[in-house]
């Protein structure tokens, strides 16, 4: 399977909410022994590999934000902890999964990574990630609403193994 990032750049004004999205593509095994671990974290454009470093989002780690379920099942993060930090990650039946960040500030600007790990018989088998940038703007140059920029076709199917 692959992970697609429909948008490579989100530009938002302070105070706005944004939903960053990734999509699971390709054949997804729906066997009973297969589950998917999906999560989000901040990172940087490393010298070696983008998304190799896992940093917290608003002090919540990738473990705090993870979803763990079968192939194309729907799921949401544990509400209390994430919502106290203005965050919610979710996954639908169609392979889309997202993180919503509320009341953005300039400090939320940076590189965000989604990670999908396929787990068979309790062992990590295959992992892929997608990357996108969020820029939060202040002042007179800030847009009135979030503006999204589509990934190039090459970027949108980010298949780099982690």
């Amino acid at each position: 399977f692959k992970v697609a990032t429909p948008y490579s750049l989100y530009v938002c004004p302070e105070g706005q909410n944004v939903t960053l999205t990734c999509r699971l593509l390709g054949p997804v095994d729906k066997g009973h022994d297969v589950t998917f671990y999906k999560t989000w974290y901040r990172s940087s454009r490393g010298e070696v590999q983008t998304c190799s470093e896992r940093r917290p989002i608003r002090n919540l780690t990738f473990q705090d934000l993870h979803l763990h379920h079968g192939g194309h099942q729907a799921a949401n993060t544990s509400h209390d902890l994430a919502q106290r930090h203005g965050l919610e990650s979710a996954s639908d039946h169609h392979g889309n999964f997202s993180i919503t960040m509320r009341n953005l500030t300039l400090l939320d600007s940076g590189l965000y990574c989604c990670l999908v790990v396929e787990i068979r018989h309790h062992h990590s088998e295959h992992r892929v990630h997608g990357a996108m940038e969020l820029q939060v703007q202040t002042g007179k140059d800030a847009p009135s609403n979030c503006v999204v920029y589509p990934s190039s076709s090459q970027d949108s199917e980010n298949i780099t193994a982690a």
Partner: antibody, heavy 121, light 111 residues
């Protein structure tokens, strides 16, 4: 080793435009950092002017915003400051500085040596 | 703008003795549990250099006699044993909201 080096005229006439460049070496400007200008009038404290990211997003101090333009040239690994309609109050040492935004702290971890710009006729 | 106020504005310390500088922000500089407060030292004729970031994290290469503490609006920089090379002006700086702002500076001299 990351180094920043400011360059530009040391003397600017009142009402003209101050132009400075900061050359970045030992590090790619196309990374998750904000590239800042900060100034310090003689014998006084530090004032943040503004920053630019490699992708061209800027943020300026509202007190100077109407006169400031910061630009980036990724091909030359450098960024620049233009401050228009200068007066004697703009006389200061001008520093460029790097600030990571891949975390939440946004600290200035690398500074240039600074260049003194005097506004005088 | 967030106004940063340092006290004292100057202090004279005997080598080997401790020193303490306070910084107060006009509003909280916390963001989801992180204190967005830095300390810098500007030695004579040099640019500022980072000492402490996020209130209490000592920058790599900075001697361990420097420490930072505090949260919300009140912060402190401590030097456990002042050395001659510590002279200069100390600045606090907030990165919670733009414009980024600095304290007015505290000048440290050796007795």
């Amino acid at each position: 080793q990351v180094q920043l080096q400011e360059s530009g005229p040391g003397l600017v006439k009142p009402s003209e435009t101050l132009s400075l460049t900061c050359a970045v070496s030992g590090f790619s400007i196309t990374s998750d950092f904000a590239w800042n200008w900060i100034r310090q009038p003689p014998g006084k404290g530090l004032e943040w002017i503004g920053y630019i990211t490699y992708s061209g997003f800027t943020n300026y101090n509202p007190s100077l915003e109407s006169r400031v333009t910061i630009s980036v040239d990724t091909s030359k690994n450098q960024f620049s400051l233009k401050l228009s309609s200068v007066t004697a109050a703009d006389t200061a040492v001008y520093y460029c500085a790097r600030q990571e935004y891949g975390n939440y702290v946004w600290y200035f971890d690398v500074w240039g040596q600074g260049t003194l710009v005097t506004v005088s006729s | 703008d967030i106004v940063m106020t340092q006290t004292p504005l100057s202090l004279s310390v005997t080598p080997g003795q401790p020193a303490s500088i306070s910084c107060r922000a006009s509003e909280s500089v916390e963001y989801y549990g992180t204190s967005l407060l830095q300390w810098y030292l500007q030695k004579p004729g040099q640019p500022p250099q980072l000492l402490i970031y996020a209130a209490s994290n000592v920058e790599s290469g900075v001697p361990d006699r420097f420490s930072g503490s505090g949260s919300g609006t009140d912060f402190t920089l401590k030097i456990s044993r002042v050395e001659a090379e510590d002279v200069g002006v100390y600045y606090c700086q907030q990165s919670r909201k733009v414009p980024w702002t600095f304290g007015q500076g505290t000048k440290l001299e050796i007795k």
